[in-house]
């Protein structure tokens, strides 16, 4: 039997792809594991292999559906299990009524690219990836600028209330290298968490011109 | 600009079926939900359900189930609701709404329905 | 169902003063809470969404709050315009169900 603190932790992106982490203290390492989706109103189920992450830790992604199909609704609930093999015969390990739309986190935002750079500002647009018609305009997001000498621990947040999938950024240094990252999250959901950070761009701002002579 | 402008109203005797259309303009109708809801004189608000465009799917409240069908027309922009088995408890206004599934964020104008005798 | 409280039934106040109109779940809806006017003769109108984010085009004078199970929309200098009915409506448990609204009149 396995004993220690178990840990189930899912995430819907809004569309065909539920993303789960079980973590179990003292589990055994060499044990075949899965998670099993049943959702309560469709006539589907889908089951995927956890493969490890860390020392007591294991991932997976339960794959639904094409990437843009709407495959639970707001309505739905599944259950969620933990399975583990035992022998012949499968245990469960740990189980969770989960609501869909109550814990979401989309896909890192796309397709960043530089609109228009100057000396001082630059402007930046992205799309959002596999996110769900429901959510209308009630999105946010988050972007931070990585300057020269910094982390981006240390990059302070933007934030824009509302889906505007564009920032103009403005008091940039003159001919410096910047790097730029955006992440979106919805306003709907009890235990929904921001998207993972979008791929870095980078960009340059144009050099000063040059004064002329007096 | 949003709009949703739905049919006229409707006089029908107990035990008809009633349906009522709602053409919208000004967004995408093919990627929306419309929704439906009920305000009869003494029973205030009441959600009857929504239809998902993109998905193709309904979804009806318990209350609701049995007596009503949302459609809707992609060509023509156009979402219906039929209610049958008329009483004279489902004499109401009936609004059409656009909005993701928890609230309504865009409202039709509201059709009168009166069951009579 | 869940069932939405909302009080008082009719809530009297002069204009340029303060009104503030209550909403109870009968059950945990976490944030799951959004109000609505509405005016003799027209639909309702979208004010605030989970509890408290304001819709765009709504004025700062409308705001919301959360409680627990009690939500509270706060109109802090009541307009002539203002004076309607203020639905609550919860999306937590299908079917999403409305509280039978506060009647905001003028004192």
């Known amino acids: 039997a396995v004993n220690g603190t178990s840990q189930f932790t899912c995430f819907y992106n809004s569309r065909a792809n539920i993303s789960c982490v079980w973590s179990q203290d003292g589990a055994l390492q060499d044990t075949s594991c899965q998670v099993h989706a049943w959702p309560d109103r469709r006539r589907w189920n889908q089951t995927c292999e956890l493969l490890p992450v860390s020392q007591a830790s294991w991932a997976c992604n339960l794959i639904l559906g094409a990437p843009d199909s709407q495959k639970l609704t707001t309505v739905d609930i599944v259950t969620l299990r933990v399975l583990c093999r035992e022998g012949v015969r499968w245990r469960v390990m740990a189980i969770q009524d989960f609501k869909p739309f109550e814990n979401l986190r989309l896909m890192a935002p796309i397709s960043l690219q530089v609109v228009h750079v100057e000396t001082h500002r630059c402007n930046i647009s992205w799309e959002i990836s596999q996110a769900s018609h429901y959510f209308e305009r009630h999105l946010e997001f988050e972007a931070r600028t990585l300057s020269p000498g910094h982390t981006w621990e240390e990059a302070p947040l933007l934030t824009l209330k509302q889906k505007q999938e564009w920032i103009c950024l403005e008091t940039l240094t003159p001919d410096t290298q910047y790097e730029f990252q955006v992440r979106v999250k919805p306003l709907q959901g009890e235990f929904t968490t921001w998207s993972p950070w979008s791929q870095p761009l980078a960009f340059r701002t144009k050099p000063a011109a040059l004064g002329k002579d007096t | 600009e949003v709009q949703l402008v739905q049919s006229g109203a409707e006089v029908k005797k107990p035990g008809a079926t009633v349906k009522i259309s709602c053409k919208v303009s000004?967004?995408?109708?093919?990627?929306?939900?419309i929704h439906w809801v009920q305000q009869a004189p003494g029973k205030g608000l009441e959600w009857m359900g929504w239809?998902?465009?993109?998905?193709?799917?309904?979804e009806y409240a318990p209350g609701f189930q049995d007596r009503v069908t949302i459609t809707a027309d992609t060509s023509t922009d156009t979402a219906y609701m039929e209610l049958s088995s008329l009483r004279s408890e489902d004499t109401a206004v009936y609004y059409c709404?656009?909005?993701?599934?928890?609230?309504?964020?865009?409202w039709g104008q509201g059709t009168t329905v009166t069951v009579s005798s | 169902e869940i069932v939405m409280t909302q009080s008082p039934a009719t809530l009297s106040v002069s204009p340029g003063e303060r009104a503030t109109l209550s909403c109870r779940a009968s059950?945990?809806?976490?944030?799951?809470l959004h109000w609505y006017q509405q005016k003799p003769g027209q639909a309702p109108r979208l004010l605030i969404i989970?509890?408290?984010q304001s819709i765009s085009g709504i004025p700062a004078r409308f705001s919301g709050s959360r409680s627990g199970t009690e939500f509270t929309l706060t109109i802090s200098s009541l307009q002539s315009e203002d004076f309607a009915v203020y639905y609550c409506?919860?999306?937590?448990?299908?079917?999403?169900?409305f509280g039978q609204g506060t009647k905001l009149e003028i004192k």
């Open positions: 709404a656009r909005g993701g599934p928890w609230f309504l964020s865009y």
């Open positions: 000004g967004f995408n109708f093919k990627e929306s939900l």
């Open positions: 239809i998902d465009n993109e998905a193709g799917e309904t």
């Open positions: 059950q945990i809806i976490s944030n799951n």
């Open positions: 989970y509890g408290l």
């Open positions: 409506q919860q999306s937590n448990n299908w079917p999403w169900t």
